[in-house]
Interface confidence: medium
């Protein structure tokens, strides 16, 4: 059998809430996988399984069940939303995210999927893990990858 | 350049109040949460609470709640603490400071420090 | 809330020697902040994120560890490096600093 390639592309978009009284933040983020199928027959999409982290703290998980199948040399764009909780013994994050004279509140979330496909019976996992800046302040829409964490954080002045 | 001017050292009697303030230069009070800290003479530092500037948002350490009360002026760009009902254990040295988040937050600038003697 | 217990509490170096300043934490943290205070003023951010330098902080200086357990290393004591350290936590409420280390130069 020939690979499966999963991609994981980035944030697709981030929507935030706020419980005012508890001074946790809600944040539902859609991600993006592209998954490529380079054999010569279909193979099943059983499942994805995603957890976000902050600050070394899972905060966020879901699982997709019986997602799709790919075709021979096929490849399809998933779409996966997890729901996450910033709750208020998260260093404060309410106060930095409810910041108002700042424009953006980019905090670093590591992304981690595993997606799990058969073909004859056979199952195999593919795991991948991102850091993504994600705008805790507002709802965001990224441009594929634009939500890429690249190693570098500079404080606002 | 970014700075924090603390009022200057304060002599109060056992019982009074006394209000601190923090002034904030080279950059935006709003953007940026303010905190304080006690020392004590001798002594290690003590986390009192933190303010939203923006929004007036506090959050106290649960031993200071009653006894300090953060404040703001955004016009002023002016932070504040009021000490209430003020005995001995009051005395000490009380520092504002910015704190900032890169990963994780941290105070990046300290105010110069208040000394408040409480004395009959 | 989380303690963090530093060690030694006072400590003399000569010039030259390693130094390392311990902070041990109740509870996991995900990373720990060092402030270096001279009497009379006010604390410096000496290292953040466990391990990054503060701007203007000596290359000789450097902090490790992870979950409960952390340090701060001098590779070659100076004797500006006199002064107290304090290791703190944003992890939880309410943030809490270490007791202090007061490094002394022989």
């Known amino acids: 059998p020939r690979s499966i390639d999963v991609k994981y592309i980035g944030v697709k978009s981030a929507y935030v809430s706020y419980d005012v009284q508890k001074r946790t933040i809600y944040l539902n983020i859609t991600n993006t996988l592209n998954i490529t199928n380079n054999n010569y027959y279909s193979v099943e999409v059983e499942n994805i399984t995603a957890q976000v982290q902050f600050a070394k703290t899972v905060i966020g998980k879901a699982r997709l069940n019986n997602i799709t199948h790919i075709g021979p040399l096929d490849m399809k764009q998933i779409d996966y939303t997890v729901p996450t909780v910033i709750a208020e013994e998260m260093s404060y994050m309410y106060d930095f995210c409810t910041l108002i004279s700042i424009k953006v509140h980019n905090i670093v979330l590591m992304m981690q999927v595993t997606v799990t496909t058969t073909y004859f019976g056979h199952s195999e996992q593919i795991s991948q893990e991102r850091y993504q800046y994600v705008d805790c302040g507002r709802n965001t829409t990224y441009q594929l990858g634009q939500s890429e964490y690249l190693n570098v954080l500079q404080p606002q002045q | 350049q970014v700075q924090l001017q603390q009022s200057g050292a304060e002599l109060v009697r056992p019982g009074t109040s006394v209000k601190v303030s923090c002034k904030a230069s080279g950059y935006a009070l709003t953007n940026y949460l303010i905190e304080w800290v006690k020392q004590r003479p001798g002594q290690g530092l003590e986390w009192i609470g933190v303010i939203n500037p923006g929004s007036g948002s506090t959050k106290y350490n649960e031993k200071f709640k009653g006894k300090a009360t953060l404040t703001a002026d955004k016009s002023s760009s002016t932070a504040y603490m009021q000490l209430s009902s003020l005995t001995s254990e009051d005395s000490a040295v009380y520092f504002c400071a910015r704190i900032i988040y890169d990963h994780d937050w941290y105070f990046d600038v300290w105010g110069t420090g208040t000394t408040v003697t409480v004395s009959s | 809330q989380i303690v963090l217990t530093q060690s030694p509490a006072i400590m003399s170096a000569s010039p030259g020697e390693k130094v390392t300043i311990s902070c041990s934490a109740s509870s996991s943290i995900s990373y720990m902040y060092w402030y270096q205070q001279k009497p009379g003023s006010s604390p410096k951010p000496w290292i953040y994120?466990?391990?990054t330098l503060a701007s203007g902080v000596p290359a000789r200086f450097s902090g490790s560890g992870s979950g409960t357990s952390y340090s701060l290393t001098i590779s070659s004591m100076e004797a500006e490096d006199a002064a107290t350290y304090y290791c703190?936590?944003?992890?939880?409420?309410?943030?809490?600093f270490g007791g202090g280390t007061k490094l002394e130069i022989k």
């Open positions: 703190q936590q944003y992890h939880s409420y309410p943030r809490t």
């Open positions: 994120r466990t391990s």
